[in-house]
Amino acid sequence: MHHHHHHHHHHAAGLNDIFEAQKIEWHEAAIEGRSITGISPITEYLASLSTYNDQSITFALEDESYEIYVEDLKKDEKKDKVLLSYYESQHPSNESGDGVDGKMLMVTLSPTKDFWLHANNKEHSVELHKCEKPLPDQAFFVLHNMHSNCVSFECKTDPGVFIGVKDNHLALIKVDSSENLCTENILFKLSET
């Protein structure tokens, strides 16, 4: 078969490289006195998203409907990818996070052009919405770099509430204490493959 591939937003950098790049970029920005808050992403990273238990996240989008599957992917199937856009938090946080000098790293997650994951705090649900930039706050998540190469996504609009897995679906999950930050159902893995 003849294949011709070209993927937008291809980045060779791994996740750890990105965290290092953030530190360098913030440092350079501080030296040069330029602002890098929130308007455009610091960097972008294309990754497949899976749970702590290695279930894949698949985005089934149509024009008028969508479904987000959390499931064991078949061996021969390729994983969906999300475009993670990294932003520096405009509001320095006192929490122990993964930013530099108290600043938090935030991300937006997009499975396809013009669509982003949104937090619906009233329904405790994770939704996909088509929208234009600037994105609403509901599309931003504070990124926490957890143990075992895992990350978690905390709602910008509702601190202490994280994207998690409930009944084989993505949902918003309230985390009561810092000890529960390592609970498996809010941990996700990012992979370039």
């Epitope: 294949h3 993927h7 294309l46 989008l61 078949k74 021969d76 990818k81 499975p111 396809t112």
Partner: antibody, heavy 126, light 106 residues
Framework: EVQLLESGGGLVQPGGSLRLSCAAS????????MSWVRQAPGKGLEWVSG????????YYADPVKGRFTISRDNSKNTLYLQMNSLRAEDTAVYYC???????????????????WGQGTMVTVSS | SYVLTQPPSVSVSPGQTASITCSGE??????AAWYQQKPGQSPVLVIY???KRPSGIPERFSGSNSGNTATLTISGTQAMDEADYYC?????????FGGGTKLTVL
């Protein structure tokens, strides 16, 4: 309502060329990968070609590789199949088909053939 | 190239259950889809991702897939279900169809 309308079929001599078109409506055309599938008279379905992003991810079945070219014009909501060096065995009804789901950043086809057009007949004969 | 094998024909009495198989190497490692085609009409997707039904497809259509065989099951078969049925998979961004099965409702 998703609608796919093929055109451009007809009678052509062996070695000749045809360009098929598929006009799409009722959905965001640019967001979906598209395919061409054909069916020879009294025979089964045969996948021919698929395309994801504009010109950047194209896929072909071996029997048509090097002779057929798939393309799309998102501004016109239209899918094309340029068929050159046609052979008698290319005689078939050609269907345009849309992926069931929108494209993903992983690229390529996803769950193809969710929606089909009515088909256009191509006859290659001297 | 990848080959999917279907029985050429299957017969069933009205109200009974019809099963149509589709065999391929390590079929269970792929997601199967099923298409219904009535004479003179375009194909219609009836099952995708092994078991899922698109909106508008009756509940009597179901699917399964494991090992080397995917199966389309039609429970309480009706006369209107008489058609050709094709299985299909996506393999490395190329489509593959089975040869088709003619379902006859006696």
């Amino acid at each position: 309502e998703v609608q796919l309308l093929e055109s451009g079929g007809g009678l052509v001599q062996p070695g000749g060329s045809l360009r098929l078109s598929c006009a799409a409506s009722g959905f965001t055309f640019s967001s979906y990968a598209m395919s061409w599938v054909r069916q020879a008279p009294g025979k089964g379905l045969e996948w021919v070609s698929g395309i994801a992003d504009d010109f950047t991810s194209t896929y072909y079945a071996d029997p048509v590789k090097g002779r057929f070219t798939i393309s799309r014009d998102n501004s016109k909501n239209t899918l094309y199949l340029q068929m050159n060096s046609l052979r008698a065995e290319d005689t078939a009804v050609y269907y345009c088909a849309r992926d069931l789901w929108m494209m993903n950043y992983a690229g390529g086809l996803r769950y193809p053939f969710g929606y089909w057009g009515q088909g256009t007949m191509v006859t290659v004969s001297s | 190239s990848y080959v999917l094998t279907q029985p050429p024909s299957v017969s069933v009495s009205p109200g009974q259950t019809a099963s149509i198989t589709c065999s391929g190497e390590r079929m269970g490692d792929k997601y199967a889809a099923w298409y219904q085609q009535k004479p003179g009409q375009s194909p219609v997707l009836v099952i995708y991702r092994d078991t899922k039904r698109p909106s508008g497809i009756p509940e009597r259509f179901s699917g399964s897939n494991s090992g080397n065989t995917a199966t389309l099951t039609i429970s309480g078969t009706q006369a209107m279900d008489e058609a050709d049925y094709y299985c299909g998979v996506l393999k490395q961004d190329t489509g593959v169809f089975g040869g088709g099965t003619k379902l006859t409702v006696l």
